[in-house]
Every structure is written in structure tokens, then in C-alpha cells.
């Protein structure tokens, strides 16, 4: 004999000894009907704020307050936003690798230094993790470009940076 709990909709719970679909109490939810209990809704407090409020069928979703970003599945923790010279990865804030920079506070990804030689210019000031290179005026007589080979710890993929 089919249990009538099987016909219960999400947002309800049902006990086998009394197979009646009952609505989830306040601050609880069930995304699958026919379960013996409803789940307690997640509360977004402290460094968290509500991204989506709880309903009888769906749990609440949290996001981090201004100045912080989510880490972990379903935003399980909040970490302070990245500083210039860093970019966000799953592990958190990671220093820009050699040949890349990020001058933004809290957002953005590490991007490659400008290749001055593309415009026939020399490097006036070397780049850092926080600042792009500064290109000088156009070079009149071109010297052959040299390739700096970046070690695997360097920029994405241990690639090469062209400088004059």
C-alpha cells in the first residue's frame, strides 16, 4: 500500500504513524515533501546578511556584508576583501604572481603588466604586484627584445614576459 506521505508537497512534513501532510512551522522549510521533519532555516547574522530569505520550501541564502567575501560552499564563512596586490581565489586572497598586478582594493583580478614593447616603448619603471609598469617614451632605435622566463611560481602557467 502506497504511503500517503509520498504525495506531500515541498513545504510540508508528514509522519508515517499519522500520514497527514502538515505545513512546516515558521522558520523551518522542506524542499522535499513527505519528510518526517522540516529543517531549521539558516540565520544570516554577524558578517552575514540575507541574500534570499527562508521560505517554507527553500532555505535562506546568506552573503557577506560590505568589505567581506564568501568562502566555502553556500557561503559558510566570510573573509575580509583582498588588498591591492592580491586577487581572490577559492583559498582566499592570493598575492599576484610575478608579472601581474591588481591596483584595486577589495575587487578585481591580477592582470598582466603592460608590454611596453608593443608600442615601441621602453620600461621606465618596473611593475609590482600593486602597480603596472610605467612605459617610457617611444624608443627610436630598437634593441632586440629579451625574454624573461618566469618560473612556474610566476604568472599563470609559467609564461614568458617580453621586455625591452
Amino acid at each position: 500500500v502506497q504511503n500517503s506521505c509520498d504525495n506531500c508537497q515541498p513545504g510540508t512534513f508528514c509522519r508515517k504513524y499519522n500520514p497527514v501532510c502538515k505545513s512546516c512551522p515558521p522558520s523551518t522549510f522542506s524542499s522535499i515533501g513527505g519528510q518526517p521533519n522540516c529543517n531549521i532555516c539558516r540565520v544570516c547574522a554577524g558578517y552575514f546578511r540575507f541574500k534570499k530569505f527562508c521560505s517554507s520550501t527553500h532555505n535562506a541564502e546568506c552573503e557577506c556584508i560590505e568589505g567581506f567575501h564568501c568562502l566555502g560552499p553556500q557561503c559558510t564563512r566570510c573573509e575580509k576583501d583582498c588588498r591591492p596586490g592580491q586577487e581572490l581565489t577559492k583559498q582566499g586572497c592570493k598575492t599576484c604572481s610575478l608579472g601581474t598586478f591588481n591596483d584595486q582594493n577589495g575587487t578585481g583580478v591580477c592582470r598582466p603588466w603592460t608590454n611596453c614593447s608593443l608600442d615601441g616603448r621602453s620600461v621606465l619603471k618596473t611593475g609590482t604586484t600593486e602597480k603596472d609598469v610605467v612605459c617610457g617614451p617611444p624608443v627610436v632605435s630598437f634593441s632586440p627584445s629579451t625574454t624573461i622566463s618566469v618560473t612556474p611560481e610566476g604568472g599563470p602557467g609559467g609564461h614568458s614576459l617580453q621586455v625591452l
Partner: antibody, heavy 121, light 112 residues
Framework: EVQLVQSGAEVKKPGSSVKVSCKAS????????IYWVRQAPGQGLEWIGN????????FYGEKFMGRATFTADTSTSTAYMELSSLRSEDTAVYYC??????????????WGQGTLVTVSS | NVMLTQPHSVSESPGKTVTISCKLN????????VHWYQQRPGSSPTTMIY?????PDGVPDRFSGSIDSSSNSASLTISGLKTEDEADYYC??????????FGGGTKLTVLG
């Protein structure tokens, strides 16, 4: 609506070069990485390299260094990939893809339709 | 070299659940995000799961992603299989130099 539209199919002779274009629209072209990925017939996806169109900075996969060249024309929001010294193993569909600026290890949210490059004598 | 290994092919009947694994050979699967793409014949890849377990708008909730640090692998699970799910699926992550790495791809066949 974000779109990446690539140039048409090419047939090339071994030893020659090919230049594939990827025209971006619907977003600020200079603020997102463009990645180049290829797929040989019946094979998986292979990363070639990427470019930051904002300043033309490039990264190349070890396998393609010295043979691939990426450029970007910000006036037309178009990225280009040139592959030289072509050989039969370079026969593949070449894709451009955009990476969001959320994190350094993010996904590719938009892909071009692909450009088939056939290398045959 | 960092490698992501996927089964070459999996098959299951409509309505059933299938899981595609993506195993990292070195390093920690939890260190960098894992993403999943679906590719139908003659089409470009499209994102099914991004940042380990997130679904883009328009992707049905039959698709879910997870990370298992004990087996150092990621998984894509498709429940209530439909014939339209038949495609190649690729996992994608990064190595320590933020170089993209792709799995070899898994061909999903929906039987019947």
C-alpha cells in the same frame, strides 16, 4: 547580451599561419580576460593561453610559446589569436572564452561558437 | 603536471541518477574552484556548474556539483536523467600558477 563571435573556418597548409578573430559585444572588453582553448577532433579541451585586452598583456601555455600570438584591438573589441608553423596536429576547433573578474580561478562564462582550423597539404 | 582524470564514458537509463567524477592527481582538490561544462556535438561548451556547486540561471536543479577531499575529487551529479542530457561533460580547475586545467571529458549516454 554578452556575445563572442568568431571568424569562419580556415583550411591551411603545413608550415603556414592562421589568424582567428573573436569579436566581443555586450560588455566592457578591456575589463575581462579572454582565453583561447582548442579541441582536436574527438578530443578534449586544451588551454592555449590568455590575454588581458586592457593592456595587451598575454600568457601562453608552454606548448604554444613562440608559436601563438595574441593581440587585441580595443577600438573594435576584437581579440586575435595567430598560430604559426602549423602542422597537422593543429587541426582543431579553436574557441575564445571570457573569464569573469570575480576570482583568479573562475569559470569561463561565455564562449565563442568556435573556429575550425584544418591543416592539410 | 597537474591532471584531472574523468571516466571516459558513463551510461544510465532515463529517470535515474548518474555521477561523473573528476580526480586531481596532485595537490588538494579543495584549493581551487572546480567548474563543469556540458558540450553537445557541434556546439560550444556551456557552464552547468561553477565554483564547485553553483548553478547558472537556466540550469535545472537536477544538476549538482560537489567536492570530496577524502578522494581528492569533484563530482557532477545529474538526477532524473533525460535524453537531452546526453553530451560530453568536462571538469575545469586550476593549478598553483592559476593555469587552467581541463579533465579529459566524459561521454554521457542516456540509454533507451
Amino acid at each position: 547580451e554578452v556575445q563572442l563571435v568568431q571568424s569562419g573556418a580556415e583550411v591551411k597548409k603545413p608550415g603556414s599561419s592562421v589568424k582567428v578573430s573573436c569579436k566581443a559585444s555586450g560588455y566592457t572588453f578591456t575589463s575581462y580576460y579572454i582565453y583561447w582553448v582548442r579541441q582536436a577532433p574527438g578530443q578534449g579541451l586544451e588551454w592555449i593561453g590568455n590575454i588581458w585586452p586592457g593592456n595587451g598583456g598575454t600568457f601562453y601555455g608552454e606548448k604554444f610559446m613562440g608559436r601563438a600570438t595574441f593581440t587585441a584591438d580595443t577600438s573594435t573589441s576584437t581579440a586575435y589569436m595567430e598560430l604559426s608553423s602549423l602542422r597537422s596536429e593543429d587541426t582543431a576547433v579553436y574557441y575564445c572564452a571570457r573569464r569573469p573578474d570575480y576570482s583568479g580561478d573562475d569559470y569561463f562564462d561565455y564562449w565563442g561558437q568556435g573556429t575550425l582550423v584544418t591543416v592539410s597539404s | 603536471n597537474v591532471m584531472l582524470t574523468q571516466p571516459h564514458s558513463v551510461s544510465e537509463s532515463p529517470g535515474k541518477t548518474v555521477t561523473i567524477s573528476c580526480k586531481l592527481n596532485s595537490g588538494n582538490i579543495g584549493s581551487y574552484y572546480v567548474h563543469w561544462y556540458q558540450q553537445r556535438p557541434g556546439s560550444s561548451p556551456t557552464t552547468m556548474i561553477y565554483r564547485d556547486d553553483k548553478r547558472p540561471d537556466g540550469v535545472p536543479d537536477r544538476f549538482s556539483g560537489s567536492i570530496d577531499s577524502s578522494s581528492n575529487s569533484a563530482s557532477l551529479t545529474i538526477s532524473g536523467l533525460k535524453t537531452e542530457d546526453e553530451a560530453d561533460y568536462y571538469c575545469h580547475s586550476y593549478d598553483s600558477t592559476i593555469t587552467p586545467v581541463f579533465g579529459g571529458g566524459t561521454k554521457l549516454t542516456v540509454l533507451g
